[in-house]
Interface confidence: low
């Protein structure tokens, strides 16, 4: 801060604002009776240059004129863009110890004259909006520059608005606060931007436009849809638009889709019939508007209308499967299973399923409705039975799907051959087979059924299955397939009235089991030892176990143990061995093997046979 120039004055020629590259003369003059006391001739005036409050130069050597003890003139050149501060100080040379005393100062601004503004663009948002224009100001002037936006129209209509740019704010857009109404649609308007600062002024070329050129309609609002006779596929989309709109663009899509259906509608007057909708589907609708068929701009898209189309009766065919279990000599339990319809087939919320079991010859019929995807009934073992299931929503029911209840694995001649299960990747298994060799009747279809081999899976979990046409001999199963789990896979060959099946185990990925079987007992019977064990816990199997190994060796022996390898069967939990010497103490243990390798050994048991050796 400079004291209010009590000692003297500082002036700048030609002006305190100069163009880039120009020189300026700064004169520092002492007021009468000011200066060094008693020795006017010892007055020395110095000029200091500050940029951003930092002293950058003493201009002692730039003195071009000097009235000793009264005034000095300095020439300054090569000033950078922006503002520079100059401070004149008085140095009394006979008093070296006193610092120079400030006399006065001046700020010099260096900049450029404004360039003509370019690329003027104006817009009015909606029929009730106001005209706002933006432009490109060109190079930065480094000076406070005023911009005036002037709109001229018919009947000498004129309007002005001003703003300014400086080192803190930029002015390249103004809202005139003027609304151009549609009755001026044929009129032409001229807009011009003028820029002015201390170094000059410039004006843009006049920019001419019409109402249609600049008015962007408001997005349509109040969007709603009416479904004709509660139809799920036909609806009338309605909305509110500004009065002058002649063209609409509609876009709509199911919510999970990635591509829009696009429709152009001319003179729609806020209404359009859609005829290709999917029933019971969440849709998103948006609308845009334009004021002229060829010219003008599209509005922004409207807010989304999200709504669900009504239901229509199901159209799909249910995929049915079943299980048969004999209960006693004259009764069997039939468990029917079916897969849910996909949404495009269900066409609504499935409320229930209609299930029918019918004995063909005696005309016995069992009927029920269920909300589940399975149904179990106990029926006589005699007679030929057929089942049918249909799905119902609020609008109706699907056509029933029929299936003949046959003994699924009853006909050996229908059993598929050479069934194999190969791991394809982490979450699927490729099952292949050969057709039955001597089937009495033609195979109508194959069913590949699979279930995790875990305790209680038959009762707890429904089966998974795939229907395969009779000319296919492979299936890639992936539904509910997880790595390190063993699955029982059955391939059924079905004819009109018979069934044959073959079974195999398979996994999608395997590791060596975590542990070996636990030997629970060793018993001696008729000179043979029976080893009993408990199976490895299901989570520790880590795939399909191919076989178990029983190892034994004499206690304290360093020799390699002997072993016996047993094909894995889920139902087996004991095995005889007969090559042990009597009255010798042995150590026994077991391991389990998958396709990935052998488990660590299970627990060790010692045993000393008493009987005669074989």
């Amino acid at each position: 801060n400079i004291d209010v120039c009590k000692l003297g004055t500082v002036t700048v020629q030609p002006a305190p604002v100069i163009p880039l590259g120009s020189a300026a003369n700064i004169s520092c003059s002492l007021n009468p009776k000011q200066g060094c006391s008693h020795y006017p001739s010892s007055n020395e005036l110095i000029l200091l240059k500050f940029v951003n409050d930092v002293l950058v130069e003493n201009l002692h050597g730039k003195k071009v004129h000097d009235h000793t003890g009264h005034s000095s003139t300095f020439q300054v050149t090569n000033l950078s863009l922006g503002m520079t501060l100059f401070v004149c100080k008085l140095n009394c040379s006979n008093s070296q110890k006193k610092p120079p005393v400030p006399v006065c100062g001046v700020e010099i601004s260096v900049g450029v004259a404004p360039e003509p503004p370019q690329n003027i663009s104006c817009v009015q948002e909606g029929e009730n909006g106001t005209v706002a224009c933006s432009w490109n100001s060109g190079k930065v002037t480094y000076l406070k520059t005023n911009y005036t936006l002037q709109l001229s129209g018919p009947n000498n209509l004129t309007c002005q608005k001003q703003c300014f740019s400086d080192n803190r704010q930029n002015c390249n857009r103004l809202d005139l606060g003027i609304n151009l109404s549609p009755d001026l649609a044929e009129s032409r308007f001229i807009v011009r931007v003028t820029a002015i600062n201390d170094l000059g002024n410039s004006s843009s070329l006049p920019h001419t436009f019409t109402f249609l050129d600049i008015v962007i309609p408001l997005p349509p609002w109040d969007i709603r849809i009416n479904f004709l006779n509660a139809s799920g596929s036909r609806g009338t989309l309605q909305w509110e638009d500004e009065g002058q709109v002649v063209l609409n663009q509609l876009r709509y899509q199911p919510l999970n889709s990635t591509s829009w259906n696009m429709v152009n509608a001319t003179n729609a007057k806020g209404k359009y019939d859609l005829r290709d909708l999917r029933p019971f589907t969440e849709y998103e609708f948006q609308i845009s508007s334009k004021l002229h068929l060829s010219g003008g701009s599209w509005s922004n898209w409207s807010e989304s209308l999200r709504t669900r189309t009504p239901e229509e009766e199901p159209v799909g065919i249910l995929d049915i499967w079943y299980m048969k279990q004999d209960i006693d000599y004259d009764r069997q339990q039939i468990s029917l299973f079916w897969k849910s319809l996909n949404p495009s087939e269900a066409r609504g919320k499935i409320l229930h399923y209609q299930v029918t079991l019918q004995e063909v010859t005696k005309k016995t019929t069992l009927q029920n409705t269920t909300r589940h995807t399975s149904w179990t009934r106990v029926i006589p073992r005699t007679g030929a039975w057929t089942a049918s299931v249909s799905a119902a929503n609020s609008k109706g029911a699907s056509a029933p799907t029929h299936i003949n209840i046959v003994d699924l694995c009853g006909t050996g001649l229908l059993a598929p051959h050479q069934v194999s299960a190969k791991s394809e990747n982490m979450d699927n298994i490729l099952v292949t087979w050969q057709p039955p060799k001597k089937a009495d009747s033609a195979v109508r279809e194959y069913i590949v059924e699979w279930r995790a081999l875990q305790p209680g899976s038959i009762t707890k979990f429904p089966p998974h299955w795939l229907r395969i046409p009779p000319d296919n001999m492979s299936a890639l199963i992936s539904e509910n397939i997880k790595p390190y789990i063993c699955y029982e896979i059955r391939v059924h060959a079905l004819s009109e009235s018979q069934g044959g099946c073959s079974s195999i185990r398979g996994d999608s990925k395997h590791k060596a089991p975590v542990s070996g079987p636990h030997i629970t007992a060793i018993t001696e019977k008729k000179e043979r030892l029976f080893i009993s064990w408990t199976h490895i816990p299901f989570p520790e199997q880590r795939g399909c176990i191919l076989h178990y190994r029983i190892y034994w060796k004499e206690r304290d022996s360093t020799a390699q143990p002997e072993l016996c390898e047993i094909q894995y069967r889920r139902s087996q939990n004991s095995h005889p061995i007969s090559s042990l010497q009597p009255r010798v103490t042995y150590v026994l243990w077991m391991t389990a093997v998958t396709a990935a390798g052998e488990s660590p050994q299970g627990n060790e048991r010692e045993f000393c046979p008493q009987g005669k050796a074989n």
Epitope: G126, G129, L218
Partner: nanobody
């Protein structure tokens, strides 16, 4: 986050007038839908009037048929305040009046559907006696 605070409710005789205000604070701007809703005891919340101000300052107002020509919606962007001038009030106008901002989703009912608004005030009671 936007906070809305209504005021101006009260009791008035039929034929009288009231002016409701809704002060917006937080992330306020003029480019938004704002609306007035009301809910009478035992009835669903219904749209009374709404206003949309676009990014260039243009706007649109909407009114329910039952209040058109009697109620006027307006806003003061400088004060971040929404107003509802209610004239020729009738007992049927008795309700709790709510201010809503930011219609981020449109349903079949358009601006009238209260589910589409992101922010709500606590409401101000208007009682009109005959």
């Amino acid at each position: 986050q936007v906070q809305l605070q209504e005021s101006g409710g009260g009791s008035v005789q039929a034929g009288g007038s009231l002016r409701l205000s809704c002060a917006a604070s937080g992330a306020t701007n003029s480019n938004r839908h704002m609306g007035w809703f009301r809910q009478a005891p035992g009835k669903e919340r219904e749209g009374v009037a709404a206003i949309y101000t676009g990014y260039t300052g243009g706007g649109n107002t909407y009114y329910a048929d039952s209040v058109r020509d009697r109620f006027t919606i307006s806003q003061d962007n400088a004060k971040n305040t929404l107003y509802l001038q209610m004239n020729s009030l009738t007992p049927e106008d008795t309700a709790m009046y709510y201010c809503a901002a930011d219609l981020t989703r449109w349903y079949s009912g358009g601006w009238r559907d209260p589910r589409g608004y992101k922010y709500w005030g606590q409401g101000t009671q208007v009682t009109v006696s005959s």
